[in-house]
Amino acid sequence: LTCLGGFASPGPVPPSTALRELIEELVNITQNQKAPLCNGSMVWSINLTAGMYCAALESLINVSGCSAIEKTQRMLSGFCPHKVSAGQFSSLHVRDTKIEVAQFVKDLLLHLKKLFREGQFN
């Protein structure tokens, strides 16, 4: 078991459960989106490979005042082994492209769904 408690259920939860809950939160965001997500804020695009969770958090943590992604930020922090703060880019190896938060969430969601369906939970 991976210790990912705090955003859905108390105590440790299996990695599959944590990943599924993150996916469901991202689905909720994309399906409930009315106005431009986070007022069209731009974030750094990331490589969806090793260290993806920390990189995603480092990118999204720089968006402030957007309640729609606060839960996602908290969930991602459960997957990232180190503390992440705004302006930190240790996992963001490539910083050459900025995309809208909405597109970032869609890309991340598509990748996480594939990982889940393949059974890659860690």
């Epitope: 599924r20 996916i23 689905v27 994309t30 399906q31 598509l110 594939k114 889940f116 369906r117 059974g119």
Partner: antibody, heavy 123, light 107 residues
């Protein structure tokens, strides 16, 4: 309107390979979040999930049968195939194909089913 | 594997009755529970997904509830066309597993 239809050999002998085809319409397996699965039901018994394949070609199998199963798809002809190697009389059942999931969430709900095709393994 | 148990294999009720069919999982399945109806001719239809969400085209007399390991399907006003076998299925973890089914008959 979503429809699925299974076809198979009807009868085959032990040790042969069972080839099943699921032909579907009303949706495309190039559409994100959709999959097609195979389920079987021996006469008078319960349902058993065998395998499924997703739009992006991710394949999952029932571990109890994995060594004997092969699932594949032909997106352009809207067909999904299942092969079961080295069949035995225990493989005698009605075989169903079903579409999996369209909600965007991963609930593994099989929202539309075919009518089923009867397969008998007998020497 | 997660075992799904439908303790009642057959059930007899009168038209207009409220009928409840139960399903128990061998571990917490976190509401990933789907219900299917299989008619005597073998036709299978999804009724309820994710514990309580009604599939499109399914009459509102069908409802689902439950949490953790215990789930139920309720038919509020039994109709002749509800004569069928009902199966639960967990979608929490692979392999996907089904209950043994509950056959519903008219008294």
């Amino acid at each position: 309107q979503v429809t699925l239809k299974e076809s198979g050999p009807g009868i085959l002998q032990p040790s042969q390979t069972l080839s099943l085809t699921c032909s579907f319409s009303g949706f495309s397996l190039s559409t994100s979040d959709l999959g097609v699965g195979w389920i079987r039901q021996p006469s008078g018994k319960g349902l058993e999930w065998l395998a499924h394949i997703w739009w992006d070609d991710v394949k999952r199998y029932n571990p109890a049968l994995k060594s004997r199963l092969t699932i594949s798809k032909d997106t352009s002809s809207s067909q999904v195939f299942l092969m079961i190697a080295s069949v035995d009389t225990a493989d005698t059942a009605t075989y169903y194909c079903a579409r999996i999931g369209s909600s965007g969430y991963i609930y593994y709900e099989m929202d539309y089913w075919g009518q089923g095709t009867s397969v008998t393994v007998s020497s | 594997d997660i075992q799904m148990t439908q303790t009642t294999s057959s059930l007899s009720a009168s038209l207009g009755d409220r009928v409840t069919i139960t399903c128990r999982a061998s571990q917490d399945i976190r509401n990933y529970l789907n219900w299917y109806q299989q008619k005597p001719d073998g036709t299978v239809k999804l009724l309820i997904y994710y514990t309580s969400r009604l599939h499109s085209g399914v009459p509102s007399r069908f409802s689902g509830s439950g949490s953790g390991t215990d789930y139920s399907l309720t038919i509020s006003n039994l109709d002749q066309e509800d004569i069928a076998t009902y199966f639960c299925q967990q979608g929490n973890t692979l392999p996907l597993t089904f209950g043994g089914g509950t056959r519903l008959e008219i008294k």
